[in-house]
């Protein structure tokens, strides 16, 4: 069985959580000492504090911690006040200021390349993969099959438009109904939600950085799946999706549109094109069944191509063979018939690095996924250390007021629509709700933006994404441009849905909860975020994969069972918290599990030993190599050339769940400086406003 | 410029079999295809079949199947056509003759014909 | 098989003058017709392919015409050397046939 977070022995205390409204934190539970829990399941344990059985927050036990490890950190000012300064330390303070800006935009100019250099490695790697998954005909009538297919394509492919788009042009082609390209579509919004939590992963060496971080990249993780789990069933049942889009596009006389304007791909474009370009259609073509595009490299060669439609003369086996009656003749020998044929000449070759190496696909694709992950490392790591040495003081008090203060009484509720609102604007100019969100990752990490404001943004990214599509789906040619609108549309209206599920009530914020608790326990063992992502983006897709290919009733047999089980221990877990008095004394906590049914200490301990021998290696290669490290092997002495493992776990080696107090350094973005892992900068010129 | 030599005129008697030959020149022997046309006294034009002396591939009209074998030789750039089981009514003049636009049934050289008589 | 009817079977006409022949299939065989002209004592000759094609050194006075089942020959302005049988032939579908021939003649 899957690992399960700590399950002790805690009884509910009601009167201690207090859920905040909107955009505000909650209250920090106080928090008993605990007496130190031995792995041997008799020894009495003290009992602790527990949020609401729907939170998953409630599967950890925390230790005594000084505060809410979900507060906003406290970004101190080290520098000297603006007015205090002559007149050459503020013309010094002003260039320093404006150099940030230009290094920031920078290192944010090569982070969107690399989430698109990314994107391209992944196609080259699974893009082929990707494209067969599409050609199976079980689609058609399995509605789960439908669903993972277009998570795993999307994952592999690190593109919602592209797989979309592979759907948009197999419906047209009356490959596929729209019926069957909904779960579908359910699926590349779960797929596309894995970039911004692989960016989250690069915040792994600050624990309570990567705790916000994580949790804020998975909120859309969880509103994804949770909408999904159910508003699939209620399509299967009622097909409103397909009933309400059609009525739409029926009901309207669409003129082509012009394309989707696109405003991110015309800075960023320019130096993509240079390392890597891709010829997308080949996936198109495999998903559609064309037996010569699987031998198809995907890696562009030519970029100025001349096609030039020609007749030529065919023999062919019998007159029956003819194009038509009319185009069927004899030289007295053979029959010949006349086909139309598209000769395409090569005139000029792409100028990109890999036009000339012919290496494999997945060559090409590796090398670039390694690079593309290193630089988005890298860029991260930049961003955050500007951010940090600029958001301090009154600067980060303004911009943390700005985002996450509520509007006055009685609007207050309007903010989080605002917030959606700005989402959806912003993910329309970029282009990517996965450039979107995965800059506000870094963002959430360093605690500019408190979970509850992302969520509402990352909401209005997924609506961002569809208004996009919508245009592109205007501007498609007439025989796609039904089918890839009310794709466009169904895809609308499922995020919509989705909101109104997850959104208008705080009590139904399920996904902030969720992800909030994954937080909690990846900041514990950060090897957990590594074994969520492979769970829940790979192994449960191509389960259900496996089981679909074989037939239902396995997927029933296989399935019912699962869900029944977790259905089992959820209705458990509700009753332990809400009324354990009704359940018999040994049901009232997990204890009559062995513990690596309850708790991932025991798990804990085999994946560190499993990464024992990787950890004087790697350690010493470099700063990001470091981070990767400390992912894998949640270990305190990994680090012998880099400290930037070593110290941040020196202080809380004795704790059960190390985190740094935001009080411990004057900033918290920039506290590896503080500690010695970077020389830290003359109080008398660091620069702290622009 | 090409030339196609037919052999002289035959007089056979019914249920015999004939021989005619066709000696090209002037082109490539194999490049063409070679069609046998019968035009019998006071009668169109019958087409009797086509071989590509490439291959060795034949054609026959149904009519002729099994009476006529077209072959050629490659290395005498000859084509052959025997015509079996004779009878009066194949009394005519046969035509050998190519077609050089590719790929064409249209024949745009001939030969002089064989004229052959069958009569007991 | 494909039979190929000519008409008329023989003509008379004025040298200048603008003569037609035709020529119907009896199914529809696209443009695949030619057309040749033999005079008495000698071997036939090419002088229109794909029905309206002139063959090398052929005179622009000959034009051909027409698709699918119906065909024309015209000579524009008939000259003495014109005179001879003209025959229309299918090249759609193995076997290859031939239409009667049209005889045309100077007045």
């Known amino acids: 069985m899957a690992p399960w977070p700590e399950l002790g022995d805690a009884q509910p205390n009601p009167d201690k959580y207090l859920e905040g409204a909107a955009g505000q934190q909650p209250t920090a539970p106080d928090k008993s000492k605990e007496t130190n829990k031995t792995d041997n399941t008799e020894a009495p344990v003290t009992k602790i504090e527990l949020l609401p059985s729907y939170s998953t927050a409630t599967l950890i036990d925390e230790p005594t911690e000084v505060d809410d490890p979900w507060n906003l950190p406290t970004l101190q000012d080290s520098g000297i006040k603006w007015s205090e300064r002559d007149t050459k330390g503020k013309i010094l303070c002003f260039f320093q200021g404006i150099g940030r800006l230009i290094l920031l935009l920078g290192f944010l100019y090569f982070f969107v390349c690399s989430l698109d250099i990314l994107s391209s490695a992944f196609q080259l790697v699974g893009g082929k993969m990707a494209g067969q998954f599409f050609s199976n005909s079980s689609i058609m009538s399995n509605p789960l099959l439908g669903l993972v297919i277009g998570v795993l394509v999307t994952v592999l492919v690190q593109s919602s438009s592209t797989s979309t788009s592979i759907v948009v042009s197999m419906v047209s082609s009356s490959l596929l109904t729209v019926r069957a390209a909904i779960p579908i579509i359910m699926g590349a919004n779960i797929g596309t939600s894995i970039t911004n939590t692989i960016v989250a992963l690069m915040q792994v060496g600050d624990r309570s950085e990567f705790r916000r971080a994580f949790a804020g990249a998975t909120v859309h993780d969880f509103f994804n799946w949770l909408s999904v789990l159910v508003l699939l069933p209620v399509e299967v049942a009622t097909h409103y999706l397909e009933i309400i889009t059609q009525l739409i596009v029926e009901s309207f006389h669409f003129k082509n549109g012009e394309d989707a304007p696109d405003l991110l791909k015309v800075i960023t474009k320019p130096f993509t094109k240079l390392i890597v370009q891709l010829d997308k259609k080949v996936i198109s073509q495999i998903a559609m069944n064309d037996e010569k595009a699987k031998n198809k490299s995907l890696v562009k060669i030519w970029c100025k191509t001349f096609t030039n439609k020609t007749q030529i003369n065919v023999t062919v086996p019998s007159t029956a063979n003819c194009t038509s009656p009319s185009l069927c003749w004899t030289d007295g020998i053979q029959n010949w018939t006349m086909k139309n044929v598209t000769y395409k000449e090569n005139i000029a070759k792409c100028q990109h690095i890999f036009v000339n190496f012919h290496l494999p696909d997945l060559a090409v694709g590796t090398i670039l996924l390694i690079l593309s992950l290193l630089v988005l490392c890298g860029c991260l790591i930049m961003i955050v250390k500007i951010l940090g040495s600029v958001l301090k003081g009154q600067v980060a008090t303004v911009i943390k007021k700005t985002i996450n203060t509520d509007f006055p009484f009685p609007f207050a509720w309007l903010t989080g629509y605002l917030a959606i609102l700005v989402g959806a604007g912003m993910t329309f100019i970029v282009q990517s709700s996965s450039v979107f969100t995965s800059a506000l990752t870094p963002l959430i990490g360093i605690g500019v933006i408190t979970i509850e404001r992302a969520y509402p943004l990352t909401l209005g990214s997924n609506i961002g994404t569809t208004t996009t599509a919508i245009l592109a789906a205007l501007a498609s040619p007439g025989n796609a441009l039904r089918s890839s609108l009310q794709i466009a549309l169904c895809h609308f209206f499922f995020n919509i849905s989705g909101i109104l599920l997850w959104y208008p009530i705080p009590f139904t914020r399920l996904p902030i909860r969720m992800a909030k608790g994954l937080g909690n326990i990846s900041a514990k063992y950060r090897w957990f975020a590594v074994f969520y992502l492979i769970i829940f983006f790979f192994l449960i897709p191509l389960t259900v994969f496996g089981l679909s290919l074989a037939g239902w009733r396995v997927l029933v047999g296989v399935g019912v069972p699962v869900v029944f089980i977790i259905i089992l221990v959820l209705c458990l877990r509700l009753l332990q918290s809400r009324c354990p008095r009704v359940l018999p004394k040994k049901l009232q906590n997990w204890n009559f599990l062995p513990l690596w049914m309850r708790s991932l200490k025991p798990w804990d301990a085999v994946v560190s030993k499993f990464t024992g021998c990787f950890q004087m290696r790697c350690c010493c290669c470099c700063r990001v190599c470091c981070r990767a490290c400390c992912l894998l092997c949640d270990c305190p002495k990994c680090c012998r050339c880099s400290k930037c493992c070593e110290d941040l776990e020196e202080a809380q080696e004795g704790q059960d769940v190390p985190v740094k107090a935001p009080e411990t350094f004057d900033n918290i973005t920039i506290s590896r400086e503080a500690q010695g892992e970077v020389p830290a900068s003359d109080s008398k010129t660091e620069c702290t406003a622009l | 410029q090409v030339q196609l030599q037919q052999s002289g005129a035959e007089v056979v008697k019914p249920g015999a079999s004939v021989k005619m030959s066709c000696k090209t020149s002037?082109?490539?022997?194999?490049?063409?295809?070679m069609h046998w046309v019968k035009q019998a006294p006071g009668q169109g034009r019958e087409w009797i079949g086509a071989i590509y002396p490439g291959s060795g591939d034949t054609s026959y009209n149904q009519k002729f199947k099994g009476r006529a074998t077209l072959t050629a030789d490659k290395s005498t750039s000859t084509a052959y056509m025997e015509l079996s089981s004779l009878r009066s009514e194949d009394t005519a003049v046969y035509y050998c003759?190519?077609?050089?636009?590719?790929?064409?049934?249209?024949?745009?050289?001939w030969g002089q014909g064989t004229s052959v008589t069958v009569s007991s | 098989d494909i039979q190929m009817t000519q008409s008329p079977s023989s003509l008379s006409a004025s040298v200048g003058d603008r003569v037609t022949i035709t020529c119907k299939a009896s199914?529809?065989?696209?443009?695949?017709v030619a057309w040749y002209q033999q005079k008495p004592g000698k071997v036939p000759k090419l002088l229109i392919y794909w029905t309206s094609t002139r063959h090398t050194g052929v005179p622009s006075r000959f034009s051909g015409s027409g698709s699918g089942t119906d065909f024309t020959l015209t000579i524009s302005s008939l000259q003495p050397e014109d005179v001879a049988t003209y025959y229309c032939?299918?090249?759609?579908?193995?076997?290859?046939?031939f239409g009667g021939g049209t005889k045309v003649e100077i007045k």
């Open positions: 199914q529809d065989v696209g443009t695949a």
């Open positions: 003759s190519i077609s050089t636009i590719i790929t064409t049934g249209a024949v745009d050289y």
């Open positions: 032939q299918q090249y759609s579908r193995i076997p290859l046939t």
């Open positions: 002037g082109y490539t022997f194999i490049t063409y295809n």
